[in-house]
Every structure is written in structure tokens, then in C-alpha cells.
């Protein structure tokens, strides 16, 4: 059988090879499609309800004003010339539908280093056959699954038009110390060959590179945190991170009701103010980051070291912030 | 929403003439064939005529051939019916229906419209 | 020309029944077949096209059937608004031919 592809909606003939070019002609086509069960046979003659979708013409031909999916499928004629001798022709018909240009919607305007980011979603309308969605980084093709590429993919079909909706979601993890502005593009490729490519204008996202996290710092002085009844505590909570963050300060795991300071006076200890110390900084852009945790103690007088199992009340007693 | 609204019947004696309209809106109108079905008082539906998207084409039952004359303007979405040598037998409600080939039969209707044949 | 041979041409049955309309084609018209329904006074309604498939907006108790040239409309529980006059068509070859119709009535 030969090969046609047609595009939807755009007129086709079929010429019935061996047919004499006027009537009176002894032909007959007989079409085996979507629209038939079986085989449906078409004569010069006919003329009806399948006149919308093909008719004979009076050169014998097969005329289908406008082809759609259902036509897809098995066209044969039958003739006989004038010595009656029989010729017969044999089609294939595939059709097709380019959709319109490939759209990136969603895309994000910018991308962090190191992790997953959703790029954007690159839709397909309106092709037939589906067809297939590729993503391209900076000019070369992304392989899903490789180096923190990942593509959600999706195919819809338009309940009367019978056409192609395509999704395609890309997710990268960009490299640190990478491209600052890489050059992200999507192309539908037809599922019929010898259609060219369609890509999408560009889009192209800053990748922001975020700065790792230096440690905070909580400086006791005295050094050990051990200090005799009546004495003064001074924790310091050191942050490099520029701006300053934000410092709260914890007790034995629970947040102290003071305003944000970086440093913490306990002036005058008691017994109540025996426990664990531990700063918060909270950073805009980071969440909050909370240091290690110091033990205060009270030394009796005579004592080498804190004294064992000496743990305060709840009470905070008198607390100066610096 | 699609619409059909057909128009002109009335009472005519036998032999003369009627022309029948029939308003289309909501679809596109040149996309499809359109056809005229009829159905006396009291009986069943009976094909009447049909036209091609294009206009190009007309088909007729044996029973209104050269009597009738079905045509459309897609310029003013609009089709049409004309009835010459009336006989007692046309009388019917006369509807007007989209399609009419095989891509989808007769999908949607008008109210239909009375046509009388009497002296 | 196609005849359409619509049976029974009546017939009466009571809410929840299940009802069988059938039309035998003279010839074979494939799958290009509907079925209408019809009140008095009121146009046709689309209910069935090509054969099995229901059009858009009718309930799911009326279903369409095919073997060979007999095209079958069934209605699994009559309703009340389902007494009314019921047509096949056939749109494979002109002339374009209805059955006869089959009026259910309320028993």
C-alpha cells in the first residue's frame, strides 16, 4: 500500500489508478477507517451522508473535503478501463495536526543552588499524533533522571477534537558554583517524521547560590560556667552571618521571655538560675539556627568544680541583657 | 448554546408556494450540512431535504424532488426551504436540523414550524 | 431504499420496567444509527448516536445496541418523563429513513 499523511482538516484525493477519466466508469473504492466497521464500499453513482467525508469524483478519484482522525486508516479502488482489464489501488492514510508553539508557563525566575527547583511546565495544544516534549539546557538536550534532572510528564486528549494536550514539568537541581543564568527551552518533536521541531522562547532564571551556614557561637565567660553564689554569668552569642540575625535565648529547652539580644547578663546568680543556656539566631532568608548549649553552675565555696546534679530552680532571678 | 429557529409556515391552497427559514446561531454554521425533516399530524418523521456545508450539494427524497429547493446563506447563518406545488400531503410540522451526513446524523433541532395544505 | 422497521409499534409498562425498542435495517447501514425521542408538541431529542453512544445530558438508564442490521434502545427503569414516542434513524445511504416510532404509554 502506498503511504499518504494528511493533515487534518485539509483536502485529500485519492486517484483510483486504471479508472477512464470520464463516466461511464466501472469502479468502485472500498474504505476500511475509523468511521467504518468492516469495509465500506463508495461508487460513482453513490452520493449521500458519506459525501461529507469522501465521495467519488467524476474522474474516478476519491475526494475527502476535509480529513480527520477517523479517516485514518485503508482506501482501496477498483477498476476496470475500457478493455476490461482491472487495476488496483491500495492507500494507507495517516494523518497528522501540528499543535501551536510550545508554551513555558510557570517558570521560575529564580533557582537555588544545591537543591530541587521546579523550573516551569512546557505545554503542547493541539497535536496529533501525541508526540513528544523535550527540555534543552542551554542548547543541549536534559536526560531525565541524570545529575538532578527530573520530568513530570502528562497527555491529555480533547474529548471531541481527538487531539494532543502534552505537559511537561522539569525539575533541576542546579550545581554550586554553576551557570548564574542558565538558558532553559522546551520543543515538541510530531510523532509523524519529516516535521520539524517546535521550541519555546527561552526562559532564562538566576540561580542564587545561598551562603553556608557558619556556626553559632556561644561564648561563657567564666570560661566552664561554673561561678560562686553572687556572681555574674555574661553569655555571648557570636553570629558572622551579615545582617545580624535576630538572638533569642533558651533555658533548659524552653524559649526566656526577653526582648532579642545578643548577649545574655546573669547578674547576682542564685540557685534558680542554674541550667542549660542555648542561643536561637534567626536568619531571613535561613531558618533559625540554635548554638550548642552551656551549663551554669554554682561552685560552694571550697569547691574545685560545679557541683554534681546541681541543677537551679525555674526561677530566673535577676537577668540583665547587654 | 446551539439554536435553531424556523420560521415562515402557514396556511397556502394547494399548488401554490412557501419559503421556510430557519435561523441557526451558536455553532459554527458553515461547518455542518443541515437537513429538513417533516412530520404530518399525527405520524411519523419523514426526511425531506439535506445541503452540504458548502451549499454545493442538495439531496431529496423521490417524494419532494423537483418540488422543493433546499439552500442556506452562511453569510447570514441562515437556511432555507422552498415549497412550490404544495399538495394536501406536505401538510406537517416542517423542523429544521443540524447534520444530516454521517458525522453525526441529526443532532439538534428546532421547534418546528406548521405548514397547511388546504383549499 | 433502506427500510427501518421499528417493533413494537406500542406499548405499555409501568415505572421501574425495562424496555426494549428495537429497528431491523433492510440493509446494512454499519453503525449509523440514532434514536430520538419525542413529546407531543415538542421536537425530537437525540438520545443514542452511532448505534451505543449516549449523547451528551441523557441519563445512563437508556442505552443503544447493535447486531448485524438490529439496533435495540433500552431503558433499564422507565421513569416517569421517559412516556413518550421513540424513533431510530438510519444516516448511512439516502434517503435518510426513520422507523415508524413506538409510543410508550403509561399501563
Known amino acids: 500500500a502506498q503511504n499518504i499523511t494528511a493533515r487534518i482538516g485539509e483536502p485529500l484525493v485519492l486517484k483510483c489508478k486504471g479508472a477512464p477519466k470520464k463516466p461511464p466508469q466501472r469502479l468502485e473504492w472500498k474504505l476500511n477507517t475509523g468511521r467504518t466497521e468492516a469495509w465500506k464500499v463508495l461508487s460513482p453513482q453513490g452520493g449521500g451522508p458519506w459525501d461529507s467525508v469522501a465521495r467519488v469524483l467524476p474522474n474516478g478519484s476519491l475526494f475527502l473535503p476535509a480529513v480527520g482522525i477517523q479517516d485514518e486508516g485503508i482506501f482501496r479502488c477498483q477498476a476496470m478501463n475500457r478493455n476490461g482489464k482491472e487495476t488496483k489501488s491500495n492507500y494507507r492514510v495517516r494523518v497528522y495536526q501540528i499543535p501551536g508553539k510550545p508554551e513555558i508557563v510557570d517558570s521560575a525566575s529564580e533557582l537555588t543552588a544545591g537543591v530541587p527547583n521546579k523550573v516551569g511546565t512546557c505545554v503542547s495544544e493541539g497535536s496529533y499524533p501525541a508526540g513528544t516534549l523535550s527540555w534543552h539546557l542551554d542548547g543541549k538536550p536534559l536526560v531525565p533522571n541524570e545529575k538532578g534532572v527530573s520530568v513530570k510528564e502528562q497527555t491529555r486528549r480533547h474529548p471531541e477534537t481527538g487531539l494532543f494536550t502534552l505537559q511537561s514539568e522539569l525539575m533541576v537541581t542546579p550545581a554550586r558554583g554553576g551557570d548564574p543564568r542558565p538558558t532553559f527551552s522546551c520543543s515538541f518533536s510530531p510523532g509523524l517524521p519529516r516535521h520539524r521541531a517546535l521550541r519555546t522562547a527561552p526562559i532564562q532564571p538566576r540561580v542564587w547560590e545561598p551562603v553556608p551556614l557558619e556556626e553559632v557561637q556561644l561564648v561563657v565567660e567564666p570560661e566552664g560556667g561554673a561561678v560562686a553564689p553572687g556572681g555574674t554569668v555574661t553569655l555571648t552569642c557570636e553570629v558572622p552571618a551579615q545582617p545580624s540575625p535576630q538572638i533569642h535565648w533558651m533555658k533548659d529547652g524552653v524559649p526566656l521571655p526577653l526582648p532579642p539580644s545578643p548577649v545574655l547578663i546573669l547578674p547576682e546568680i542564685g540557685p534558680q538560675d542554674q541550667g542549660t543556656y542555648s542561643c536561637v539566631a534567626t536568619h531571613s532568608s535561613h531558618g533559625p539556627q540554635e548554638s550548642r548549649a552551656v551549663s551554669i553552675s554554682i561552685i560552694e565555696p571550697g569547691e574545685e568544680g560545679p557541683t554534681a546534679g546541681s541543677v537551679g530552680g525555674s526561677g530566673l532571678g535577676t537577668l540583665a541583657l547587654a | 448554546e446551539v439554536q435553531l429557529v424556523e420560521s415562515g409556515g402557514g396556511l397556502v391552497q394547494p399548488g401554490g408556494s412557501l419559503r421556510l427559514s430557519c435561523a441557526a446561531s451558536?455553532?459554527?454554521?458553515?461547518?455542518?450540512?443541515m437537513t429538513w425533516v417533516r412530520q404530518a399530524p399525527g405520524k411519523g418523521l419523514e426526511w425531506v431535504a439535506s445541503?452540504?456545508?458548502?451549499?454545493?450539494?442538495?439531496y431529496y427524497p423521490d417524494s419532494v424532488k423537483d418540488r422543493f429547493t433546499i439552500s442556506r446563506d452562511n453569510a447570514k447563518n441562515s437556511l432555507y426551504l422552498q415549497m412550490n406545488s404544495l399538495r394536501a400531503e406536505d401538510t406537517a410540522v416542517y423542523y429544521c436540523?443540524?447534520?444530516?451526513?454521517?458525522?453525526?446524523?441529526?443532532?439538534?433541532w428546532g421547534q418546528g414550524t406548521l405548514v397547511t395544505v388546504s383549499s | 431504499d433502506i427500510q427501518m422497521t421499528q417493533s413494537p409499534s406500542s406499548l405499555s409498562a409501568s415505572v421501574g420496567d425495562r424496555v426494549t425498542i428495537t429497528c431491523r435495517a433492510s440493509?446494512?447501514?454499519?453503525?449509523?444509527v440514532n434514536w430520538f425521542q419525542q413529546k407531543p408538541g415538542k421536537a425530537p431529542r437525540r438520545l443514542i448516536y452511532?448505534?451505543?453512544n449516549l449523547a451528551d445530558g441523557v441519563p445512563s438508564r437508556f442505552s443503544g445496541s447493535r447486531s448485524g442490521t438490529d439496533f435495540t434502545l433500552t431503558i433499564s427503569s422507565l421513569q416517569p418523563e421517559d412516556f413518550a414516542t421513540y424513533y431510530c434513524?438510519?444516516?448511512?445511504?439516502?434517503?435518510?429513513?426513520f422507523g415508524g416510532g413506538t409510543k410508550v404509554e403509561i399501563k
Open positions: 451558536g455553532f459554527t454554521f458553515n461547518n455542518y450540512w
Open positions: 445541503i452540504d456545508n458548502s451549499g454545493d450539494n442538495t
Open positions: 436540523a443540524r447534520g444530516g451526513d454521517i458525522r453525526e446524523g441529526l443532532r439538534y
Open positions: 440493509q446494512d447501514v454499519g453503525i449509523y
Open positions: 434513524l438510519e444516516f448511512d445511504e439516502h434517503p435518510l429513513t
Open positions: 452511532r448505534a451505543t
